[in-house]
Interface confidence: low
């Protein structure tokens, strides 16, 4: 622990004026792990004048930094770059004549206490006035600065010509883009002092490059990835006083992909789970043993979770029987393409028969089965069960459903008793 300081596993405090410290305290290599330090308190250190760029970087867990009644004159711009956990800073009664917002802009500070410093009245500290104005009244501090006459004036009264917040205005083409294409965003910034322009693209995956010239900037995004759909892109104008930003959301259109399709699981209903990605939202169509599956209130598609361009859902089946065993294929399509994926589903064996070894059926009943006019139609009043007899389906003028005679008496079927008069015997 440095001379004139005391250290614990989480705290460093340097309050003894003699002999005092001349540099920001650093721990010896084999002492406490600096990452565990959450609080540093420095007081009465008249010879501590500077916080250098690398003085504080080792204390990545630092939450509270207090330097009071000391000689602090200068803080390097990047001094707190690595200290993202900092919440409370107290620089009361030091020798600071200026302090830039660049020191703190990346921090989520709860407190920044700066009373008792001999600030010079200039545009450099106008950001403090702006900060004070946004705070609720109990949180405000009595900050003063020395004017040209070396008179103390309240920061609240500070008026500096040509010293105001900047503005940013984003001119972007309609940011609905097809995957793989490119787009250029244009941004104009203004203000006095002249702001710098930068782009905040967050975790954008797509390749992007920017060009900036004074008050104009462009961001070129090339070979746009579908992973970037829904992401926000911001143009930021920043000067001494503060910053402004203008944002747009990126929408990427791309062909569907069925990323997940699995065998049925049984909960309250039976469910064939799937995940589909695509934008615009893909239309979904199921096929059963190669034929279109006519959805009804007994067999229907349910989307349970929508995550922007990803859809998680089920083909939900109410009390399926052995007659619903077979191959289920999901097709997803939009104007950019389509995808199909298939699974084999086995809900149960035939009553009294080992389905695995004897898949032959007794005499069956047929029901006409016509294609719905609308994909995903769940209003169809019919409640047919898809056929499991693939060979028999192959050359039919009308697609037909199969129902085993043995099953007609059961109550837990997808066919209700009222519908039985619709069936004709073959």
């Amino acid at each position: 622990c440095p001379t004139s300081c005391k250290c614990s596993s989480a705290r460093i405090w340097c309050t003894e004026p003699s002999p005092g410290i001349v540099a920001f305290p650093r721990l010896e290599p084999n002492s406490v792990d600096p990452e565990n330090i959450t609080e540093i308190l420095i007081a009465n250190q008249k010879r501590l004048e500077i916080i250098n760029e690398d003085d504080v970087e080792a204390y990545v867990g630092l939450r509270n930094l207090t330097i009071v009644d000391s000689g602090l004159k200068f803080v390097a711009y990047k001094a707190f770059l690595k200290n993202s956990n900092l919440r409370h800073i107290n620089f009361t009664r030091n020798k600071l004549t200026s302090l830039s917002r660049r020191h703190f802009r990346h921090l989520d500070l709860s407190d920044l206490i700066l009373t008792g410093n001999p600030f010079t009245c200039s545009c450099d500290i106008m950001w403090l006035k702006t900060l004070q104005e946004t705070k609720s009244s109990p949180d405000t501090q009595d900050l003063y600065c020395l004017n040209e006459s070396s008179k103390n004036m309240p920061l609240a009264n500070l008026q500096i010509p040509n010293c105001g917040l900047p503005s940013a205005r984003l001119a972007a083409p309609n940011l609905t883009v097809e995957e793989g294409k490119s787009v250029t965003l244009s941004c104009s910034v203004g203000g006095d002092p002249l702001p710098t322009l930068y782009w905040d693209v967050g975790n954008l995956v797509s390749k992007h490059m920017n060009e900036t010239s004074h008050t104009q900037g462009s961001l070129r995004i090339t070979n746009i990835s579908s992973d970037d759909s829904g992401k926000q892109i911001s143009c930021v104008a920043e000067n001494l006083v503060g910053e402004d930003q203008d944002s747009v959301n990126l929408t990427v259109h791309f062909a569907p992909t069925i990323t997940f399709l699995e065998s049925p699981t049984s909960d309250h209903h039976w469910c064939i789970p799937f995940t589909v990605r695509g934008n615009p939202k893909p239309a979904l169509q199921w096929f059963y043993n190669g034929a279109i599956l006519n959805e009804s209130k007994y067999i229907c598609t349910k989307i349970h979770v929508t995550n922007h361009t990803e859809y998680h859902g089920c083909l939900q089946l109410d009390n399926p029987t052995h007659m619903n065993n077979g191959d289920y294929t999901l097709m997803a399509k939009n104007e950019y393409g389509k995808d199909e994926r298939q699974i084999s589903a086995h809900f149960m064996g035939r009553p009294g028969v080992d389905y695995e070894t004897n898949p032959n059926y007794p005499e069956v009943l047929y029901e006409d089965w016509t294609t719905p006019t609308d994909i995903g139609d769940t209003t169809n009043k019919s409640n047919e069960i898809p056929s499991t007899d693939v060979a028999d389906q192959s050359n039919r003028e009308h697609e037909q459903k199969l129902i085993s005679e043995e099953d007609l008496g059961g109550e837990q079927k997808l066919i209700s008793e009222e519908d039985l008069h619709h069936h004709h015997h073959h």
């Epitope: 972007a172 083409p173 294409k181 244009s186 490059m209 060009e211 104009q216 070129r220």
Partner: antibody, heavy 119, light 112 residues
Framework: EVQLQQSGPELVKPGASVKISCKAS????????MNWVKQSHGKSLEWIGD????????SYNQKFKGKATLTVDKSSSTAYMELRSLTSEDSAVYYC????????????WGQGTTLTVSS | DIVMSQSPSSLAVSAGEKVTMSCKSS????????????LAWYQQKPGQSPKLLIY???TRESGVPDRFTGSGSGTDFTLTISSVQAEDLAVYYC????????FGSGTQLEIK
């Protein structure tokens, strides 16, 4: 004065490749996108692609992917377009054009390079 | 891809006359927030390279005579020459820069 000086006319055989140059003067090459445009005889203009001279990043018209390759030499302030596997369909005048105001419009054009593909 | 259609393909007028030519895009070129249309007009005189006349659909490029006026928004655009001069003999192209770049087929202006 901004100028884009293109290389001279080319007569090449089918199947060959050709590299057309465009030397920029009067401005800094890296300040603007460089675009390439094709004009077949008596026909309209077709955008081929553009290049960011700072980092060589390119965008292409789908039609010209695999046909055209855009590059720059910053040291000589020159942009290049190479055309490969040439056929008579590639016979045309090719222009380089500076992309101004974020490359939304082309404010300065080269004088054009005439390419003739003939056996 | 955005398709640009120009009409007429050619027209002949006498010097001093007013002339208009049309350009239509297959989708809107308007940025709703900035109210800017991503459309430009170019002039190509015989044996010369194209020259930028109008950008953002209606902004005249510096040095372009004020007899050239661009108008329109969304998908329908017009180039007007208020009083045609002999030196205006050229082909006029519109171009969109909304999604990549596409040129129209051109309008040939002849002087009677």
């Amino acid at each position: 004065e901004v100028q884009l000086q293109q290389s001279g006319p080319e007569l090449v055989k089918p199947g060959a490749s050709v590299k057309i140059s465009c030397k920029a003067s009067g401005y800094t090459l890296t300040d603007y996108y460089m675009n390439w445009v094709k004009q077949s005889h008596g026909k309209s203009l077709e955008w081929i692609g553009d290049i960011n001279p700072n980092n060589g990043g390119t965008s292409y018209n789908q039609k010209f992917k695999g046909k055209a390759t855009l590059t720059v030499d910053k040291s000589s302030s020159t942009a290049y377009m190479e055309l490969r596997s040439l056929t008579s369909e590639d016979s045309a005048v090719y222009y380089c054009a500076r992309g101004a105001y974020y490359s939304n419009y082309f404010d300065y054009w080269g004088q054009g390079t005439t390419l003739t593909v003939s056996s | 891809d955005i398709v640009m259609s120009q009409s007429p393909s050619s027209l002949a007028v006498s010097a001093g006359e007013k002339v208009t030519m049309s350009c239509k895009s297959s989708q809107s070129l308007l940025n709703s927030r900035t109210r800017k249309n991503y459309l430009a007009w170019y002039q190509q005189k015989p044996g010369q390279s194209p020259k930028l006349l109008i950008y953002w659909a209606s902004t005249r490029e510096s040095g372009v005579p004020d007899r050239f006026t661009g108008s329109g928004s969304g998908t329908d655009f017009t180039l007007t020459i208020s009083s045609v001069q002999a030196e205006d003999l050229a082909v006029y192209y519109c171009k969109q820069s909304y999604i990549l770049f596409t040129f129209g087929s051109g309008t040939q202006l002849e002087i009677k």
